[in-house]
């Protein structure tokens, strides 16, 4: 039959000559063996067919063995996160073998053609594989392959193409242009490993989404919803605008993925929580916190296999930078009535009180108006361990929704700057901890003063019957 | 052991082009990126570009994108950086320099190329 | 661009005292952080790289230490050859940048 054009024809027409007539081709993509922490160390290339580098670099068949994937590259020159990756697996996993994948070669060129070449890169891996396990005490099952952006899609090719399943494929933001809507096969897929765990950071609804929208794994993770990541706005990464352009930002978000998943191996006692939700929206609003019917998970290395499950998306906030942990809380504050509300709609603030620590003061972020004699959902986060909640002071101050509102309430307030007439009546704020699964109902310090002016602060103490304690899994608990 | 050897000094006219070579040794020239840096009287050292000596990629820094060449010879283990449109301010010390396995940080360097630009 | 801004830009100490040197980055480079010395008409010396990782054939009296912005030389008992000048150097994206450099003189 008919040989391909392109690098796949190319490989195959090389592999079907004969052995002496065989021309002297560098190979196109590379296994380098990290058999040293040191960025100095060459590392042992490892060649399809030859035992011995095996054995001269100390590959160790039982011990789980990590193949990391990069993705298109505008530059010839590895990206500094790969060393970050490979550095944090020696750390983690001490016994572990860490193979780069060098596809360099193939990934230097138009996006377009590189994306062509993912398929002979993935049956490339593949190969390697399939040759692995002819190896006494080698398994398929300790196989870990690690793909960022497009690399993600050549795990997912290589996971496809392989004799038996991959243990695990983790795609970090896998790339979006050309993928996105694609078929399974042409695409990383649930069906590529016994697990498939992917972490989203730039996905875009508008314009181009340089990482996948869609869930590609058994569980997919949206850090921060998916998109707009701390510390990678505009005025974080260019510090001036002098010094960079929006490739910044876009690399910034790109490769938090990368960054997380590093979180998760070096920063073992500090694991990230995602939690099971519909959208993006619902998280927002808090409804989502929950562990039960493995609803929650860890993030990154750490994340466990859940089973039945495809394409479950999760969620979570994370700090601008390592580590990423914060502490998820839901809030729900009945609003028991609006007095002389107008057309203002209110924003809350809270401050939260434990035994550890005591955070800032959190805007409570506003997804739907606010509902009058109901119960208000909010999602707060703090970047630092509170320990148990012991109070809650809330403020509110009102927001207009219209110009002619906005002069109405400056000249109200000029006339009249604390405006008494303006209240809501809060009696209790229910809290909800995403991370301990504990449920608390905090009352009013004073029951017969729950009415709260704009400025003013309202005090909530634990109620009475103390802990609300739910039945529900806590994720610290499946920690090892 | 490792070893990067630079061609002569250069005396240049203004809008001349500049070839300086560095021959390596003592490891594998295709498995380390090569740098070049520059160094102008007084000044900071400045990264001008890199390649990856395996298949001859290159990255460069934008502001010497339009004017600098790096290639190489696998043959001859050597690296290659030719600058263009010399100015007077092109008047500098320059390195070829050797990255690690990520080319991060460089451990060997070779002994500088002097290049006047002067009419 | 990332800029780096190192500091002090000349360091006066007497030999045997301890020396410390500073260098910003303008944005988080995490590790990516490399320290080099040079001497007058020779190349640049690798020191420490990946901020705190020692050198085969380098001294131990140099250290080094930080992340994210902020990292730190340490020369804890200057020896008479170690007067030069320090340049840091970020590999975090590119270009690679590197300071402008800190002159370390004897007192």
């Known amino acids: 039959s008919p040989t391909p054009f392109g690098p796949e024809g190319q490989l195959a027409d090389e592999l079907h000559k004969p052995k002496a007539i065989q021309t002297e081709v560098k190979p196109s993509v590379r296994f380098n063996l990290r058999t040293s922490k040191d960025p100095e160390h060459e590392g042992c290339y490892l060649s399809l067919g030859h035992s011995q580098p095996l054995e001269d670099c100390g590959f160790n068949m039982t011990a789980k063995t990590f193949f990391i994937i990069h993705g298109w590259t505008m530059s010839g020159i590895f990206e500094n996160w790969l060393h970050k990756l490979v550095s944090a697996l020696h750390t983690r996993e001490k016994d572990a073998n860490v193979v780069v994948v060098d596809w360099l070669p193939l990934a230097h060129q138009l996006y377009t053609d590189a994306v062509n070449n993912t398929r002979v890169v993935g049956h490339s891996i593949a190969r390697m594989l399939d040759w692995l396990q002819e190896k006494d005490d080698f398994s398929l099952g300790n196989v870990h392959l690690i793909g960022y952006s497009l690399g993600a899609h050549v795990a997912g090719y290589a996971g496809n193409f392989v004799k038996g399943t991959v243990g695990r494929i983790t795609g970090l933001d896998p790339a979006g242009p050309m993928f996105e809507g694609a078929d399974i096969h042409k695409r990383l897929s649930p069906d590529d490993a016994d697990f498939v765990d992917v972490l989203h950071t730039y996905t875009r609804s508008f314009g181009l989404s340089i990482g996948i929208q869609m869930p590609v794994g058994h569980i997919d993770i949206y850090p921060n919803g998916g998109d707009f990541q701390p510390g990678c706005g505009l005025n974080d990464v260019l510090g001036s605008m002098a010094y960079g352009t929006i490739t910044e930002v876009v690399k910034c978000e790109h490769e938090r993925a990368v960054h997380l998943f590093v979180d998760s191996l070096v920063n073992q006692d500090k694991p990230s929580f995602a939690f099971q939700c519909t959208d993006s929206n619902r998280f927002k609003k808090g409804i989502c916190l929950s562990c039960r019917k493995n609803r929650c998970n860890s993030i990154g290395y750490n994340a466990k296999k859940m089973r039945n499950k495809r394409n479950s998306k999760m969620y979570l906030k994370t700090r601008a930078g390592m580590p990423f942990r914060v502490y998820h809380y839901q809030m729900k504050i009945h609003v028991f009535s609006y007095k002389n509300m107008g057309e203002i709609e209110p924003t809350f603030y809270v401050t939260l009180y434990g035994t550890n620590a005591d955070s800032q003061t959190l805007p409570l972020e506003i997804v739907e108006r606010i509902e009058q004699n109901a119960t208000n959902t909010f999602l707060v986060y703090t970047e630092e361990d509170l320990g148990d909640l012991l109070k809650i002071q809330l403020t509110w101050e009102g927001a207009s929704q219209s110009w002619y509102n906005l002069w109405k309430e400056l000249r109200s307030y000029l006339s009249q700057p604390h405006n008494p007439g303006r209240e809501l009546n809060i009696r209790r704020i229910r809290v909800k901890s995403g991370e301990t699964q504990r449920k608390l109902t905090f009352c009013a310090e004073d029951p017969e003063n729950t009415s709260i002016s704009p400025g003013r602060e309202l005090w909530f103490r634990k109620c009475r019957d103390g802990w609300r304690m739910k039945n529900e899994t806590s994720p610290t608990v499946e920690l090892p | 052991q490792v070893q990067l050897v630079q061609s002569g000094a250069e005396v240049k006219k203004p809008g001349a082009s500049v070839k300086v070579s560095c021959k390596a040794s003592g490891y594998t020239f295709t498995d380390y990126t090569m740098h070049w840096v520059r160094q102008a009287p007084g000044q900071r050292l400045e990264w001008m570009g890199g390649i990856n000596p395996y298949y001859g990629g290159t990255t460069y820094n934008e502001k010497f994108k339009d004017r600098v060449t790096i290639t190489r010879d696998t043959s001859a283990s050597t690296a290659y950086m030719e600058l263009s449109s010399l100015r007077s301010e092109d008047t500098a010390v320059y390195y070829c320099?050797?990255?690690?396995?990520?080319?991060?940080?460089?451990?060997?360097w070779g002994q500088g190329t002097t290049v006047t630009v002067s009419s | 661009e990332i800029v780096m801004t190192q500091s002090p830009a000349t360091l006066s100490v007497s030999p045997g005292e301890r020396a410390t040197l500073s260098c910003r980055a303008s944005?988080?480079?995490?590790?990516?952080l490399h320290w080099y010395q040079q001497k007058p008409g020779q190349a640049p010396r690798l020191l420490i790289k990946?901020?705190?990782q020692s050198i085969s054939g380098i001294p131990a009296r140099f250290s080094g230490s930080g992340s994210g912005t902020e990292f730190t030389l340490t020369i804890s008992s200057l020896q008479s050859e170690d007067f030069a000048v320090y340049y840091c150097?970020?590999?975090?994206?590119?270009?690679?940048?590197f300071g402008q450099g800190t002159k370390l003189e004897i007192k």
């Open positions: 990946y901020a705190s």
């Open positions: 944005q988080d480079i995490s590790n990516s």
């Open positions: 320099a050797k990255g690690d396995y990520y080319g991060g940080s460089y451990n060997y």
């Open positions: 150097q970020q590999s975090n994206s590119w270009p690679y940048t």
